[in-house]
Interface confidence: low
């Protein structure tokens, strides 16, 4: 196979957040982030090769303590396919409860043209520190 | 490509910890740990091939309850490049808050000669159980 | 190498759980789950190729709040090799403490014929939502 498509993205949002959608960025201006294959479109990741991907994410809440997290509960992060609409589905979902960071990963089939969106519901802000909040994919097999 | 460089390490520290740096080991005496490519130097992992790596870690605190964790807050784990100094950077950071385990992973570019260090700040000790505390890397692409 | 063996499984349990063992399933009836190489045997995953694997899991507790989680503590998830008996070992272990989701991953050597089992101890039930509870493996190298 050619080199596996991979991407590692950093948070690139304008605050205060007007909607729950997190916007991502990559490249030298955003730390050690990159896209090799997938592309960014308006802050979302677009897949350019069919296959099974490992999708991973870590999100840390800003200025957060376990008290803050529980007071603002529910704060939930979801990663899903948001377009095309016919393939819309939630792939990964986690709630913060009394913690200030969630991190997870999963294998999932993705198709060329799938766009991945990440939604953070609740009133807390995500950290933009490059070692605390990131989102990425790695092509594993056809 | 030749076989991807991989390593899975177990904790190999002397208690009580005199400094926040965790020291790792691999091999039959330390459970199901190994190094295929990267090497251990004084308990830190040294990279021997340029590329994008998946770095993952899980650390569980010993003799810990949610009460202990919150009383001893902040307890934070950071994974970073510690040498060469010119490339020093924090790659991954998590706090324990009211939990006793953190686990995460990320894709990051690493270069031959980069040494990865893991720092656990705070007064709590990490568990040495091989299924609770481990740290590893997997080469993904050039 | 031929295509890497991979599997991503969804929960396929009968409630109420009579024992702590979680049973998994794959295929169209269970969301975006699949087995490419490994096989399911009575809800457990059987490995069909020797090598180093990335094992990952996320389990979310159903009808859970941080209060529920702490009141029902200890609730612990363990992933291990359960057969053949001679190779029985715990690979990955996490407790829920005051959280309702655990997620982690690790690299580990597995051999053809190894069967992986996942045990959830405690009285709380796992969520069957396909974006909240899943378990998978990915072959990485020989």
């Amino acid at each position: 196979h050619p080199e596996p498509h991979t991407a590692e993205l950093q948070l690139n949002l304008t605050v205060p957040r007007k909607d729950p959608t997190l916007r991502w960025g990559a490249g030298p201006a955003l730390g050690r982030s990159f896209t090799h294959g997938p592309e960014l479109e308006e802050g979302h990741l677009r897949i350019h090769r069919d296959g099974i991907y490992m999708v991973h994410i870590q999100v840390t809440l800003a200025i957060c303590s376990s008290t803050t997290a529980s007071r603002h509960h529910p704060t939930t992060l979801a990663v899903g396919i948001c377009s095309p609409a016919s393939r819309s589905i939630s792939l990964l979902r986690l709630s913060f409860h009394q913690g200030c960071t969630i991190a997870s990963q999963r294998l999932t089939p993705l198709a060329r043209g799938d766009t991945l969106c990440t939604n953070l519901t609740g009133t807390l802000l995500p950290s933009r520190n490059t070692d605390e909040t990131f989102f990425g994919v790695q092509w594993v097999r056809p | 490509h030749p076989e991807p460089h991989t390593a899975e390490l177990q904790l190999n520290l002397t208690v009580p910890r005199k400094d926040p740096t965790l020291r790792w080991g691999a091999g039959p005496a330390l459970g199901r740990s190994f190094t295929h490519g990267p090497e251990l130097e004084e308990g830190h992992l040294r990279i021997h091939r340029d590329g994008i790596y998946m770095v993952h870690i899980q650390v569980t605190l010993a003799i810990c309850s949610s009460t202990t964790a919150s009383r001893h807050h902040p307890t934070t784990l950071a994974v970073g490049i510690c040498s060469p100094a010119s490339r020093s950077i924090s790659l991954l950071r998590l706090s324990f808050h009211q939990g006793c385990t953190i686990a995460s992973q990320r894709l990051t570019p690493l270069a031959r000669g980069d040494t990865l260090c893991t720092n656990l700040t705070g007064t709590l000790l990490p568990s040495r159980n091989t299924d609770e505390t481990f740290f590893g890397v997997q080469w993904v692409r050039p | 190498h031929p295509e890497p063996h991979t599997a991503e499984l969804q929960l396929n349990l009968t409630v109420p759980r009579k024992d702590p063992t979680l049973r998994w399933g794959a295929g169209p009836a269970l969301g975006r789950s699949f087995t490419h190489g490994p096989e399911l045997e009575e809800g457990h995953l059987r490995i069909h190729r020797d090598g180093i694997y990335m094992v990952h899991i996320q389990v979310t507790l159903a009808i859970c709040s941080s209060t529920t989680a702490s009141r029902h503590h200890p609730t612990t998830l363990a992933v291990g090799i359960c057969s053949p008996a001679s190779r029985s070992i715990s690979l990955l272990r996490l407790s829920f403490h005051q959280g309702c989701t655990i997620a982690s991953q690790r690299l580990t050597p597995l051999a053809r014929g190894d069967t992986l089992c996942t045990n959830l101890t405690g009285t709380l039930l796992p969520s069957r939502n396909t974006d909240e509870t899943f378990f998978g493996v990915q072959w990485v190298r020989p």
């Epitope: 949002l13 605050v15 730390g31 957060c64 009133t123 802000l125 933009r128 520190n129 490059t130 | 950071r93 | -």
Partner: antibody, heavy 122, light 111 residues
């Protein structure tokens, strides 16, 4: 103990340039966002610029955008502010300030240097 | 024109209680503005006192407390001491990525 020591201030003519430095010690510099904050004589504080821990992302107050450039060298534990096209209204004490590192979008400055005075006058 | 407003000066007696406020020229201050308070004595750099509305920075005495009072952020000093005489600046998060500082309140401890 966290220490931030600014240098490079002085008298400069309008339209001139100056480069401020801040030497950091006592903490892991590469983990923290860093900022410049200024205070005109007898006035309040004004946030000027920040830079992320890796040095790749920078932000500026509208009043200095296009004229000032923030940078850092993590291997030297140093922060810099290159100031070009200086104006009389840039006269101030310039403080180097560490972001508290509370995972924040919101700059919270938990450690400050003693400041260096920049005077822009003909 | 200042966006963030503070009382120019206030006076308190030793042992007394004083409340400094921090408002917006237009609109109300909420916890989403992450009010932060700094203390500055003459010739010194500012010192962080309170962040995230009401969280005391490490080493700050508990006589300093933060809150939201009505439509403003507030810093309350109970049992004022002579060395509390200083200028106090509040900072509000209004738009990414900057904070806006108030003009400062000069606190005098009469003694």
């Amino acid at each position: 103990e966290v220490q931030l020591v600014e240098s490079g201030g002085g008298l400069v003519q309008p339209g001139g340039s100056l480069r401020l430095s801040c030497a950091a010690s006592g903490f892991t510099f590469s983990v923290y966002y860093m900022n410049w904050v200024r205070q005109a004589p007898g006035k309040g504080l004004e946030w000027v610029s920040d830079i992320n821990n890796e040095g790749g992302t920078t932000y500026y107050a509208d009043s200095v955008k296009g004229r000032f450039t923030i940078s850092r060298d993590n291997s030297k534990n140093s922060l810099y502010l290159q100031m070009n096209s200086l104006r009389a209204e840039d006269t101030a004490v310039y403080y180097c300030a560490r972001d508290a590192g509370y995972s924040n979008h919101v700059p919270i400055f938990d450690s400050w240097g003693q400041g260096t005075l920049v005077t822009v006058s003909s | 024109q200042a966006v963030v407003t503070q009382e120019p000066s206030l006076t308190v007696s030793p042992g007394g209680t004083v409340t400094l406020t921090c408002g917006l020229k237009s609109g109300s201050v909420t916890s989403d503005n992450f009010p932060t308070w700094y203390q500055q004595t003459p010739g010194q750099a500012p010192r962080l006192l309170i962040y995230n509305t009401n969280t005391r920075h490490s080493g700050v005495p508990d006589r300093f407390s933060g809150s939201i009072l009505g439509n403003k952020a507030a810093l309350t000093i109970t049992g004022a001491q002579a060395d509390d005489e200083a200028e106090y600046f509040c900072a509000l998060f209004i738009s990414n990525p900057s904070v806006e500082f108030g003009g400062g309140t000069q606190l005098t401890v009469l003694g």
